[in-house]
């Protein structure tokens, strides 16, 4: 049994780090493998993560962690029974992937405007809370050619779009993702998408 692609880990800068790797052949990850992790810190204990399958040869492990601070460094040991397959380390503050925004809602009852709101995935005491910027993807199921990305570089998790910039009488979908510039993060996963019908019609004199 051998590792084809070494574990790569990302932290949500809150309480979970996710490690993914690929094995040399089909593996029952939860039955055959264990990922042991330990914070390099006085009197810390070794903790065990039971991986799940992620495709035929892929494994994924969700490591429970404390709040992240820049000094934190973890040792990682991947075991198959008594056999050590891989040994490495992981500094969560240097590999951050934010949590996806949630509760994406579309408000169409605002005159001439489509208002999108969503929730910041972090509590106010988390360092990422005031550092997130967002990308909102809007596309149409009726018009495959229409797909736009709106960059939201201000802190408020809202986006206003003039309803007149969207075609009337067709459905649109939106989703949002986040990243934190000062922490050099990757983009989060996209939020679940939400759908709405654009019923806005221009006033008669503008037609």
């Amino acid at each position: 049994m051998k590792v084809l692609q070494e574990p790569a880990c990302v932290s949500d800068y809150m309480s979970i780090s996710t490690c993914e790797w690929k094995m040399g052949g089909p593996t029952n990850c939860s039955a055959e493998l264990r990922l042991l992790y330990q914070l390099v810190f006085q009197s810390s204990e070794t903790h065990t993560c039971v991986p799940e399958n992620n495709g035929g040869v892929g494994c994924v492990c969700h490591l429970l962690m404390d709040d992240v601070v820049s000094m934190d460094n973890y040792t990682l040991d991947l075991w198959a029974g008594q056999q050590l397959l891989w040994k490495g380390s992981f500094k969560p503050s240097e590999h951050v992937k934010p949590r996806a925004p949630g509760n994406l809602t579309v408000h169409t009852n605002v005159s001439d405007t489509v208002l999108l709101t969503w929730s910041n995935p972090y509590p106010p005491d988390n360092y990422l809370y005031n550092d997130l910027t967002y990308a909102v993807n809007i596309w149409s199921e009726n018009d495959p050619a229409y797909s736009r990305i709106h960059n939201v570089t201000y802190l408020k998790p809202t986006l206003r779009i003039p309803a007149s910039t969207l075609k009337s009488g067709i459905s649109y979908r939106a989703r949002v993702r986040a990243w934190a510039q000062h922490y050099n993060t990757t983009w989060s996963e996209w939020s679940p998408s939400t759908k709405w019908y654009n019923s806005y019609r221009e006033p008669f004199e503008q037609r």
């Epitope: 810190f41 006085q42 009197s43 810390s44 204990e45 070794t46 962690m65 601070v69 000094m71």
Partner: antibody, heavy 125, light 112 residues
Framework: EVQLVESGGGLEQPGGSLRLSCAGS????????MTWVRQAPGKGLEWVSS????????YYADSVKGRFTISRDNSKNTLYLQMNSLRAEDTAVYYC??????????????????WGQGTTVTVSS | DIVMTQSPLSLPVTPGEPASISCTSS???????????VDWYLQKSGQSPQLLIY???KRASGVPDRFSGSGSGTDFTLKISRVEAEDVGFYYC?????????FGQGTKLEIK
């Protein structure tokens, strides 16, 4: 009441051995790291050794490494310090102390907040 | 190893007057914001040490509020706002960032 009680001290010849014990009560012993600190006559405090709550991780001062062994029996709520190859400079009062909560991912530290009464070790021929 | 240097080593104080003890470490004891791994202990004559302050500025349970700790990184201070006769003894700073834990030399506080 949270309490630590040491025992096992005494007079021993150079090169001899002693085993110190520290019985804990009033707290969940297995969740805490534990530490030994000593004080030579008329001197200051010197850290000797520490052990994590599970007993898997141990730490030693250079002055005792290879001669002293720290261990614990969580079923008996007891900490031990096995002292071999004793030297005159090991003469001191030995204290055990309750250290950090080590079962959390990042151990939680509240100082060495409970100390035993101390047990005296004298190494002399 | 981290070296802890205390000053003064002797501190005669008049009851009711303030007292201050300084402790300097050879490297930073700041692990994360608000978490400086330095403690202060008092050892009264013939007794075991007792914890006064942990993590730089957090008062241990049952410690009178006339004791306070401050500082960050490498420079730390223990202050007693009004010294009482029962405060006499040896005061030690200790770093607990990692092993080996190291203590300062101790400061002997005595009443004038």
């Amino acid at each position: 009441e949270v309490q630590l009680v040491e025992s096992g001290g005494g007079l021993e010849q150079p090169g001899g051995s002693l085993r110190l014990s520290c019985a804990g009560s009033g707290f969940t012993f297995r969740t805490y790291a534990m530490t030994w600190v000593r004080q030579a006559p008329g001197k200051g405090l010197e850290w000797v050794s520490s052990i994590s709550g599970s007993g898997d991780n141990t730490y030693y001062a250079d002055s005792v490494k290879g001669r002293f062994t720290i261990s614990r029996d969580n079923s008996k709520n007891t900490l031990y310090l096995q002292m071999n190859s004793l030297r005159a400079e090991d003469t001191a009062v030995y204290y055990c102390a309750k250290d950090r909560v080590s079962i959390t991912i990042r151990p939680r530290y509240y100082g060495l907040d409970v100390w035993g009464q101390g047990t005296t070790v004298t190494v002399s021929s | 190893d981290i070296v802890m240097t205390q000053s003064p080593l002797s501190l005669p104080v008049t009851p009711g007057e303030p007292a201050s003890i300084s402790c300097t470490s050879s490297q930073s004891l700041l692990y994360s914001i608000g978490y400086n791994y330095v403690d202060w202990y008092l050892q009264k004559s013939g007794q075991s040490p007792q914890l006064l302050i942990y993590l730089g500025n957090k008062r241990a349970s049952g410690v009178p509020d006339r004791f306070s700790g401050s500082g960050s990184g490498t420079d730390f201070t223990l202050k007693i706002s009004r010294v009482e006769a029962e405060d006499v003894g040896f005061y030690y700073c200790m770093q607990a960032l990692g092993s080996p834990y190291t203590f300062g030399q101790g400061t002997k506080l005595e009443i004038k």
